[in-house]
């Protein structure tokens, strides 16, 4: 699996999307987990509704929400009030019994809140926001890791 990078701004919301084949994963609950180290386990953060038919209902665990469009084949995770400690490697998973298929590997990067910069003339808002209010809409910037890039910094 390639790793997709999603960037969000500290204090704002970040939306991560994981597309999948809706027929291949028909009847499967989904989950969002955080990778603990390069070789470590993936620790479950939140999973979709216990009843697959109700997967469209948003479920929260703390500041993380998950919802699944099972017909369209898109799992959406929202990280609310993004903080620097939220940065790291995650996975979207499709669940069956004790098994979990990886749908997408995600690297979450947290950018400094531009409002922390005191010079208002240097403010940058994601997207093409025209007003101050628009700057706080949910957004994400995503890309795939380039070949050779590693999601975890080398340990000394």
């Amino acid at each position: 699996h390639n790793t997709t990078v999603f960037q969000g701004v500290a204090g704002q919301s970040l939306q991560v999307s994981c597309p999948y084949d809706s027929m291949k994963h028909w009847g499967r609950r989904k989950a969002w987990c955080r990778q603990l180290g390069e070789k470590g386990p993936c620790q479950r953060v939140v999973s979709t509704h216990n009843l697959w038919l109700l997967s469209f209902l948003r479920r929260w665990n703390g500041s993380t929400a998950i919802t699944d469009d099972t017909l369209g084949g898109t799992l959406t995770i929202t990280l609310r009030n993004l903080q620097p400690h939220d940065a790291g490697l995650y996975q979207c998973q499709s669940l069956h019994g004790s098994e979990a298929d990886t749908l997408r590997k995600v690297l979450v990067e947290v950018l400094a809140d531009p409002l922390d910069h005191r010079d208002a003339g240097d403010l940058w808002f994601p997207g093409e926001s025209e007003s101050f209010e628009d700057a706080h809409v949910e957004h994400s910037i995503s890309r795939s890791l380039l070949e050779g890039e590693i999601p975890f910094p080398p340990t000394s």
């Epitope: 084949d21 027929m23 291949k24 994963h25 028909w26 009847g27 499967r28 009843l51 697959w52 038919l53 069956h96 019994g97 004790s98 098994e99």
Partner: antibody, heavy 121, light 107 residues
């Protein structure tokens, strides 16, 4: 009618290669996993592996990993089971089966009629 | 991998009687268990999936109880067409594994 039709019986010598087939009809072949099951003479059923023809995602049971190759051609709705070098111990009946996924559980609901493979010198 | 055991290996029953077949898993398989019937020279036929859901066209005399590690398939009143081999299959952990089977024959 939803069905899986397998290729005919084969008699082979040890060391020879072989590919048997399983053709699906009456349903969207790309949207269901196809599993392969072995049954040696007078014995029970053994799960070999499974393939999703939509993207050729393939999983093998550890016992069969490296022993066989599972593939599919979605353009002709056919799954395959292949050996590069047969052994006498490969003599068995081989079944393909469709896995239907659902909210109440998974089901190998449609089975092929089986292909008898005999390997003998 | 999960090891499935079935008992008895052979069950001799008279037509019209009740047959009780057991399937045990070496660890919990939740409700991810199926039962199949196989007659000599034929492909297996799905009877039950999701531990207790009867497949299309399977008569009500076939029922399953249990979950986790212990499952029981009951055929309430054996008909002549029910004499066959019965296999359970767990699909909770990879790889899926079949039980060794129970032969139900005529007493």
């Amino acid at each position: 009618e939803v069905q899986l039709v397998q290729s005919g019986a084969e008699v082979k010598k040890p060391g020879e290669s072989l590919m048997i087939s399983c053709k699906g009809s009456g349903y969207s072949f790309t949207n269901y996993w196809i599993g392969w099951v072995r049954q040696m003479p007078g014995k029970g059923l053994e799960w070999m592996g499974i393939i999703y023809p939509g993207d050729s995602d393939t999983r093998y049971s550890p016992s069969f990993q490296g022993q066989v190759t599972i593939s599919a051609d979605k353009s002709i709705s056919t799954a395959y089971l292949q050996w590069s070098s047969l052994k006498a111990s490969d003599t068995a009946m081989y079944f393909c089966a469709r896995r239907r996924q659902g909210i109440w559980g998974d089901a190998l609901d449609i089975w092929g009629q089986g292909t008898l493979v005999t390997v003998s010198s | 991998e999960i090891v499935m055991t079935q008992s008895p290996a052979t069950l001799s029953v008279s037509p019209g009687e009740r047959a009780t077949l057991s399937c045990r898993a070496s660890q919990s398989v939740s409700s991810n268990l199926a039962w199949f019937q196989q007659k000599p020279g034929q492909a297996p036929r799905l009877l039950i999936y999701g531990a207790s859901t009867r497949a299309t066209g399977i008569p009500a005399r076939f029922s399953v109880s249990g979950s986790g590690t212990e499952f029981t398939l009951t055929i309430s009143s054996l008909q002549s067409e029910d004499f066959a081999f019965y296999y359970c299959l767990q699909d909770n952990n990879w790889p899926p594994t079949f039980g060794p089977g129970t032969k139900v024959d005529i007493k």
